[in-house]
Amino acid sequence: PGPPPGPPRVSPDPRAELDSTVLLTRSLLADTRQLAAQLRDKFPADGDHNLDSLPTLAMSAGALGALQLPGVLTRLRADLLSYLRHVQWLRRAGGSSLKTLEPELGTLQARLDRLLRRLQLLMSRLALPQPPPDPPAPPLAPPSSAWGGIRAAHAILGGLHLTLDWAVRGLLLLKTRL
């Protein structure tokens, strides 16, 4: 085997990784909240908006106590991948009205991507199961009108806000078990 190697290079402890993941999730939550408010100011929402292709909310806050670490991280990763795909679609096909949300929407996409990588790294460091992502869903159809794009944006940002809020609570609870 040869001589023992020198001191290994330092990388974050999984608990420190979880701390920074919580911080990143909180930051993303604040970004999403701000962007949703910006959207409401420019294009007031007339009631709740839904998009069938969005994931259903993972868990109520009351049910968090029963969660296990792999389940939380796996579900969170799957849901955030779906939201990433929707944000990419919104930027590409949302129409000229939504151009007013740039560059914030681009920043949101980049941070979402970073959070996904952080979650994957955490799962690797803990050696938790990492099931493959669901097979790619059929491409999202472009909005039927400018107003359709705005309604979709309300639904995406609203759903992402709820998911990230759940994620912060879930990750903080999991920290106590690690």
Epitope: D13, R117, S124, L128, Q130, P133
Partner: antibody
């Protein structure tokens, strides 16, 4: 300083058994998934097995499934690999590794030969 | 045969930039799983060089950089030095194994 120290390697006959140990220090052992990775003489790295931070998940490469068992004792900061029904092709340096893997031990040589 | 494909050898002269590729499939790298790179100096254990496609652990010089696109990844070493002569391995999670898969390794020679 992070340290992973493997022991238990040696010469064993085909069909025999060996138990490798890996003593960990300098980091929170119970927060890391742990791997065994091997390297046959002059060859590349081959992943062997992994165990989750709390021991609840264990996975094996097809080449060792049913013959090798990975386990850990978080109270002793120690990782184990029980190797049964050893074959000549199991001859390699066996490394224990933590995390991604982020940290590696210096390895212990297992030789399977008659 | 390795699940991740790397060129068996690469070479360069001191000061040069060298790139090592790592090609996977839709079941590992292409499914969004991150790529990690290891350096194994002669006679020693592997060391983590790059994690999560492009992140450098503390202590790793910024001459080393990683990137990922589609089903492949690459490691770039700029300002090549004689002490960079080593074997380099890429690795990625493979859900069918529930564990990491390694590339076959690339032997880097500094001429």
């Amino acid at each position: 300083e992070v340290q992973l120290l493997e022991s238990g390697g040696g010469l064993v006959q085909p069909g025999g058994s060996l138990r490798l140990s890996c003593a960990a220090s300098g980091f929170t052992f119970s927060s890391y998934g742990m791997h065994w990775v091997r390297q046959a003489p002059g060859k590349g790295l081959e992943w062997v097995a992994v165990i989750s931070y709390d021991g609840s998940y264990k996975y094996y490469a097809d080449s060792v499934k049913g013959r090798f068992t990975i386990s850990r004792d978080n109270s002793k900061n120690t990782l184990y690999l029980q190797m049964n029904s050893l074959r000549a092709e199991d001859t390699a340096v066996y490394y224990c590794a933590a995390g991604v893997p982020d940290y590696w031990g210096q390895g212990t040589l297992v030789t399977v030969s008659s | 045969q390795s699940v991740l494909t790397q060129p068996p050898s690469a070479s360069g002269t001191p000061g040069q930039r060298v790139t090592i590729s790592c090609s996977g499939s839709s079941s590992n790298i292409g499914s969004g799983y991150d790529v990690h790179w290891y350096q194994q100096l002669p006679g020693t254990a592997p060391k983590l060089l790059i994690y999560s496609n492009e992140e450098r652990p503390s202590g790793v010089p910024d001459r080393f950089s990683g990137s990922k696109s589609g089903t492949s990844a690459s490691l770039a070493i700029s300002g090549l030095r004689s002490e960079d002569e080593a074997d380099y391995y890429c690795a990625a999670w493979d859900p069918s194994l529930s564990g990491p898969v390694f590339g076959g390794g690339t032997k880097l020679t500094v001429l």
